[in-house]
């Protein structure tokens, strides 16, 4: 099994500019989880979908913050527009 | 029913602490994130502070960072503001808030802080 | 931080009257929400993601707008409608609120 797999791998952009990150989470998973680590700020659950639908998605109050999982293999995050402080290493993560 | 009620509030002299309480029933508090906002007497909404479901996801006014702790105890269905090193200008009417539709949805009544000599 | 600017800050209008209130953010925005607020009373959720109308709101309420403008309008005023109305974006943290607009009967 190849793990969750995301992509890009690594991405930057200029302030403004919309970022769309894309996670294909591990086959038979029925969960999966947007994370956000920063070293001010640590490890954040921005949202979370069970069966393609969103569970909770209070780690991203900002509306420019958007995430969808049309279907039970592929989910996006997107941020527009993007901010400096959006800087930072993004977790997709799935469980059974 | 959703409701929010809050407490804690009341005179405090400057340079004082007070700890607002928020008591939410009527949803499942822990599947929802969590706002603090004030208004000043005669004054407009100010936002104060944001906490996710799950405590991970904090944010503040940047005029309020080292003063204002927000947190929260899913177990007991309650939102926390710890106010410390109070000023004449903290005083205010302390609303607690759902967060719904990335919008504030349900609001309490608002307890009333003063900060006087 | 994007500065929330309503306008009017006060509007005196009549029964029946379509009133306009304008939110303009000094930094374009994705969306605006609306609130109401009475005397004493805790703010009431109105409209959100811009245009949306929140559960129990009448249809006379209405909203519009994109980038920095955005618009909130009362089709026809009812006497449960004198209030102060707030826009505030949630784009981007600190969640700033305009300075209200104090609707008053005329």
């Known amino acids: 099994d190849a793990g969750v797999i995301q992509s890009p791998r690594h991405e930057v952009t200029e302030m403004g500019q919309e970022v769309t990150l894309r996670c294909k989470p591990i086959s038979g998973h029925n969960s999966l989880f947007w994370y956000r680590q920063t070293m001010m700020r640590g490890l954040e659950l921005l949202i979370y979908f069970n069966n393609n639908v969103p569970i909770d998605d209070s780690g991203m109050p900002e509306d420019r913050f958007s995430a969808k999982m049309p279907n039970a293999s592929f989910s996006t995050l997107k941020i527009q527009p993007s901010e400096p402080r959006d800087s930072a290493v993004y977790f997709c993560a799935s469980s059974l | 029913e959703v409701q929010l009620v809050e407490s804690g509030g009341g005179l405090v002299q400057p340079g004082g602490s007070l700890r607002l309480s928020c008591a939410a029933s009527?949803?499942?508090?822990?599947?929802?994130?969590m706002h603090w906002v004030r208004q000043a007497p005669g004054k407009g909404l100010e936002w104060v502070s944001y906490?996710?479901?799950?405590?991970?996801?904090?944010y503040y006014a940047d005029t309020l960072k080292g003063r204002f702790t927000i947190s929260r105890d899913n177990s007991k269905n309650t939102l926390y503001l710890q106010m410390n090193s109070l000023r004449a200008e903290d005083t205010a009417v302390y609303y607690c808030?759902?967060?719904?539709?990335?919008?504030?949805?349900?609001w309490g009544q608002g307890t009333t802080v003063t900060v006087s000599s | 931080d994007n500065q929330l600017t309503q306008s009017p800050s006060f509007l005196s209008a009549s029964v029946g009257d379509r009133v306009t209130i304008t939110c303009r953010a000094s930094?374009?925005?994705?969306?605006i929400y609306w609130y109401q607020q009475k005397p004493g009373k805790a703010p009431k959720l109105l409209i959100y993601?811009?245009?949306n109308l929140a559960p129990g709101v009448p249809s006379r309420f209405s909203g519009s707008g994109s980038g920095n403008e955005y618009t909130l309008t009362i089709s026809s005023l009812q006497p449960e409608d004198f209030a102060t109305y707030y826009c505030?974006?949630?784009?981007?943290?600190?969640?700033?609120f305009g300075q209200g607009t104090k609707l008053e009967i005329k």
């Open positions: 505030q974006q949630f784009t981007s943290s600190p969640f700033t």
């Open positions: 009527g949803f499942t508090f822990s599947n929802f994130g």
């Open positions: 906490i996710s479901s799950g405590s991970s996801t904090i």
């Open positions: 930094s374009s925005v994705n969306y």
């Open positions: 993601y811009t245009s």
């Open positions: 808030a759902r967060r719904g539709e990335k919008a504030m949805d349900y």
